[in-house]
């Protein structure tokens, strides 16, 4: 942009150098050249000469008018055509910007990732503003009334060391730019309720060679939280629909979960957990791919029931990924199926 330009005159913008996108804008150029009575005054936008809506106001001043200016940024300068000069003479230049006042930040969420030592708050900023917009995060203790503020761009990490005096807080976000200010709704936060357990990882999987082959998935977490509720979702790589199996987990040892799956198929598994009874989930773990073994004998194979399995009342839901690129976004389907486990087994995945 034109940051430091030696002007031989002045250039100014109405309503101002930063204005609301879509507004009508007038840009004025006033020359103060020595030894020049300009024949013409010219305007340039981003280096290109403008030809329309230019008015010569008097000997020294001209104006260009833009209807509904909608470019986020432009570099304007003006020149004079001086008699006897082969080249135009620069008068002045200005950077101009158009944008929007901020939307009220929405979907404010604050979580503490276990062991991180931070409370991380995120929000939706709304539509693009196109101009520099600051976010001020307010954190007010409901017990001491003390308020802290943090400047942010799109999220903030607040050290839990600075949240020692209280467990209950009110959090809100203020969006500020030169065109306006908006506040998010206030979020009530209890620090004990927003902890997300340390990441869960699927370490390996194996398919047994039994008459009815079963796949055992091994998974673990370094969490110190005692009561953890988890979901494991799985599907064949060719399928759009996920099945979801639920567990109460105790991570003092590696979890083992059993599945009766289609033979000779490639499956994807992912797991996520939350503290039991709380609302914040871990993100889904990295996809873990496992190939089930080939069917050895011919038999009437049914994936969800067999003579060796009795049913429990826990459900396996089915969800459909909106797109293969966005596995996190899911749409619940109404199908419900029972999950089975071996009658003799005493495995820890029974939740």
């Amino acid at each position: 942009g034109i940051t430091s330009i030696n002007c031989s005159g002045d250039m100014w913008v109405e309503p101002g150098e930063i204005f609301q996108m879509g507004m009508n804008v007038s840009i004025y150029c006033q020359e103060a050249l020595k030894h020049c009575r300009p024949r013409n005054l010219y305007f340039y936008k981003n280096g290109f000469k403008e030809e329309f809506d230019i008015t010569r106001i008097n000997r020294t001043t001209a104006r260009i008018w833009y209807k509904g200016f909608s470019e986020p940024h432009a570099y304007m300068h003006c020149t004079a055509e001086c008699p006897g000069h082969f080249q135009e003479t620069l008068i002045c230049g200005k950077d101009i910007s158009s944008g929007h006042p901020p939307d009220a930040p929405s979907n404010l969420t604050c979580v503490i990732y276990e062991y991180s030592g931070n409370m991380t708050c995120t929000w939706n900023t709304g539509k693009p503003t196109y101009i520099d917009t600051k976010y001020i995060v307010h954190v007010k203790s409901l017990e001491t009334e003390e308020e802290q503020q943090y400047l942010a761009s799109s999220y903030v990490k607040i050290s839990t060391d600075s949240l020692q005096g209280s467990r209950k807080y009110l959090v809100w976000v203020q969006a500020v730019n030169s065109l306006g200010m908006e506040n998010s709704q206030q979020l009530h936060v209890h620090l004990d309720d927003i902890v997300i357990p340390s990441a869960s990882i699927i370490s390996r999987a194996e398919t047994t060679n039994d008459t009815v082959p079963k796949t055992i998935v091994y998974w673990k977490s370094k969490t110190m939280i005692e009561k953890v509720f988890c979901e494991m979702r799985y599907k064949t790589t060719t399928n759009q629909t996920w099945s979801v199996k639920e567990f109460d987990a105790n991570f003092t040892y590696v979890q083992q979960s059993e599945f009766y799956l289609e033979p000779d198929s490639k499956y994807v598994f992912q797991v996520r957990c939350q503290e039991t009874g709380k609302r914040n989930w871990q993100p889904w773990s990295s996809p873990f791919v496992h190939q089930t073994s080939q069917e050895t004998g011919k038999r009437n194979w049914q994936p969800w029931s067999s003579p060796f399995v009795h049913q429990t009342s826990q459900t396996v839901s089915q969800v459909t990924a909106k797109s293969s690129h966005e596995p996190q976004k899911m749409e619940m389907l109404s199908a419900t199926i029972f999950r089975g486990h071996p009658a003799s087994g005493n495995h820890q995945d029974i939740g």
Epitope: E17, Q148, Q149, L151, S153, S178
Partner: nanobody
Framework: QVQLQESGGGSVQAGGSLRLSCAAS????????MGWYRQAPGKERELVSM???????FYADSVKGRFTSSQENAKNTVYLQMNSLKPEDTAMYYC??????????WGQGTQVTVSS
């Protein structure tokens, strides 16, 4: 850590003017987004003006057209020129230095009292 010291407050009649100054010391001043805030008795602290890094300035609706913020980098000082003061402008005025991801640092404040 930056330290801030406000000055220039006082008592004035409605319609009068005051110019507040905020002198900053400390190595992080250059990375500060500087703002002026005020807190009236029994009310929350509110943002009055903020110098935004693209060279623009935010003004609260209640002061637009009456207050002007400016910055003198050589002196590490920001100013708040307050014209056409009203009784509802009576408050403790604070300057604040905000850096990305860090807790906002406040000055001690300067009292402005506008009588009718």
């Amino acid at each position: 850590q930056v330290q801030l010291q406000e000055s220039g407050g006082g008592s004035v009649q409605a319609g009068g003017s005051l110019r507040l100054s905020c002198a900053a010391s400390g190595y992080t001043y250059s990375s500060c987004t500087m703002g002026w805030y005020r807190q009236a008795p029994g009310k929350e602290r509110e943002l009055v003006s903020m110098l935004i890094s693209d060279g623009s300035t935010f003004y609260a609706d209640s002061v637009k057209g009456r207050f002007t913020s400016s910055q003198e980098n050589a002196k590490n000082t920001v100013y708040l020129q307050m014209n056409s003061l009203k009784p509802e402008d009576t408050a403790m005025y604070y300057c604040g230095c905000a850096t990305l991801g860090s807790r906002t640092v406040w000055g001690q404040g300067t009292q402005v009292t506008v009588s009718s």
